[in-house]
Amino acid sequence: QPSVSPGEPSPPSIHPGKSDLIVRVGDEIRLLCTDPGFVKWTFEILDETNENKQNEWITEKAEATNTGKYTCTNKHGLSNSIYVFVRDPAKLFLVDRSLYGKEDNDTLVRCPLTDPEVTNYSLKGCQGKPLPKDLRFIPDPKAGIMIKSVKRAYHRLCLHCSVDQEGKSVLSEKFILKVRPAFKAVPVVSVSKASYLLREGEEFTVTCTIKDVSSSVYSTWKRENSQTKLQEKYNSWHHGDFNYERQATLTISSARVNDSGVFMCYANNTFGSANVTTTLEVVDKGFINIFPMINTTVFVNDGENVDLIVEYEAFPKPEHQQWIYMNRTFTDKWEDYPKSENESNIRYVSELHLTRLKGTEGGTYTFLVSNSDVNAAIAFNVYVNTKPEILTYDRLVNGMLQCVAAGFPEPTIDWYFCPGTEQRCSASVLPVDVQTLNSSGPPFGKLVVQSSIDSSAFKHNGTVECKAYNDVGKTSAYFNFAFKGNNKEQIHPHTLFTP
């Protein structure tokens, strides 16, 4: 029995005064705890516990299951113990068949003996199979058999505790060892989507998938720069012995603008940690933003092609798109497609293909798009560059020579006089009057220019050239003069195209 210095509280004393007691099945167990501050007896075996507030513990007919550690505790929290073996030839082992070991750690096969005097207390494989060569164990009759440094390869190993009794081997019930793997890498985490765009009131739900060798991995959703605990829901599975998957789903049933931000799924195990983020943007209503991919003022040469291209952001998804010209909607010649196939894509492209444009096809081309919340539009002003065309060239009654030309950009008209039979007209003539006329056609059409010169200035036979030109090309008209006496006659004008 323990002894302590006078004045200090001492542990209780137990009778019989020995650390171990062996009784036979059916015999009485009588244990007396002596202490002025007695509190209780506690009995422990395997994971079971029992208490007794009497200072004398009496079991009239002992059974094998009464084998275990009896501890008496006093009011100072000091205690003393005795271990009782109840020898029962028919029940040599007490067992708790749940057997779980952590990789690289020791684990206890819980098969304590009811008789400490049996021999060769050890482990054996089931159905006569040998144990793994590297499996080492240490027997302890009061606790069981400790397997040292559990290996992952021992998972699902079937074994028995074994003793020799009267020359025969006796086996316990079978145990199946389940090995909890040690973490030798960080968890693998992924998120269902990297970004979310929602309108106020819509549900935000995002799922984080955590993969690891066992479910002991810790995971949580966190809001960046916030300590608030987020509500999450779990689903999990073991796909194989060391292949665990958890899905942690975070939900905000009615998202608000101030819920916008970065959410992190964080996972860690004893090896290390990993995280992945998703961004939530909540807008009060939907939107459409259009970005022209070319200048909205377009110049194109007569007969050439042009593509009017826009990119636009639309949230929610666009519902109606159209291209319009002169109040008419295009049914073909255009295409509309998402910029990417990404699930969270909000960017789209629309292209109108105008082919072999005529001078009469200039004007405003409008792209319109709408979704459930908003409409948006963008206009392109298309100008078709055309070579000047001389509309009229006449000698007026007042003796003026007049030339009217149309084209885009606005043509310039120059006048030249060629004396006699010379082919090249080089002497320029200044016009008396130049006017830009309003075209009766649509806006963006050809511009009409009228230029006049005084024919009285010409005293000799020859040719007058009216030359209309712009960036695209030039066209000329000619007036031929012949003098008969004092009379000047205009011989039929004619035009020549000069490329």
Partner: antibody, heavy 123, light 107 residues
Framework: EVQLVQSGAEVKKPGESLKISCKGS????????IGWVRQMPGKGLEWMAI????????RYRPSFQGQVTISADKSISTAYLQWSSLKASDTAMYYC????????????????WGQGTLVTVSS | DIQMTQSPSSLSASVGDRVTITCRSS??????LGWYQQKPGKAPKLLIY???NLETGVPSRFSGSGSGTDFTLTISSLQPEDFATYYC?????????FGGGTKVEIK
């Protein structure tokens, strides 16, 4: 003897709150997860949630999350299931049960069951 | 969620009959399966854990087998006290789920 003892039957009105208990004895309470299982009249068993009394780590069936709260007081070896606002559809027998020592803590089967607490919600 | 489908939902048998109940999971659950017996007005009782291990104190006429997705509970010789409802339960992952139950009645 290893056992779980649950609190007695309850009759409540819709909208009322309730907390039922489950006291473990005969074993080390913090070594085992405690689960709660619902059985509606004439129906099968439905797992609701579990708790690790050692650190109060909890797992809920998604359909029960936010509807009920589980907790544990390891100092008195007791687990609890509570409602803040009962509905008629909460009428059922509720069992607490101990998870056998699964190697991840909760993957074993339920080896010890309480006797059940009948909750009746009626106006 | 992992769905557990039990069949049949009920059966009639006589004392001494061999009875087999099957349970199928919607995905592989290794051998993480338990079988329970429930009598009217009583709490369920664990019979088999880890698909094939007999719980301490349960008569040896009960046995379990299977792994992956298909599992079987067999009562080799039905006794009067075995008339009850039997449930399977997967313990592979969350949420834990039970089969719908098989009621074994007297023929």
């Amino acid at each position: 003897e290893v056992q779980l003892v649950q609190s007695g039957a309850e009759v409540k009105k819709p909208g009322e709150s309730l907390k039922i208990s489950c006291k473990g004895s005969g074993y080390s309470f913090t070594n085992y997860w405690i689960g709660w299982v619902r059985q509606m009249p004439g129906k099968g068993l439905e797992w609701m949630a579990i708790i690790n009394p050692r650190d109060s780590d909890t797992r809920y069936r998604p359909s029960f999350q936010g509807q009920v709260t589980i907790s544990a007081d390891k100092s008195i070896s007791t687990a609890y299931l509570q409602w803040s606002s009962l509905k008629a559809s909460d009428t059922a027998m509720y069992y607490c049960a101990r998870h056998g020592r699964g190697y991840e803590g909760y993957e074993g089967a339920f080896d010890i069951w309480g006797q059940g607490t009948l909750v009746t919600v009626s106006s | 969620d992992i769905q557990m489908t039990q069949s049949p939902s009920s059966l009639s048998a006589s004392v001494g009959d061999r009875v087999t109940i099957t349970c199928r999971s919607s995905q592989g659950i290794r051998s993480d399966l338990g079988w329970y017996q429930q009598k009217p007005g009583k709490a369920p009782k664990l019979l088999i854990y880890d698909a094939s291990n007999l719980e301490t104190g349960v008569p040896s006429r009960f046995s379990g087998s299977g792994s992956g997705t298909d599992f079987t509970l067999t009562i080799s010789s039905l006794q009067p006290e075995d008339f009850a409802t039997y449930y399977c339960q997967q313990a592979n992952g969350f949420p834990l789920t039970f089969g719908g139950g098989t009621k074994v009645e007297i023929k």
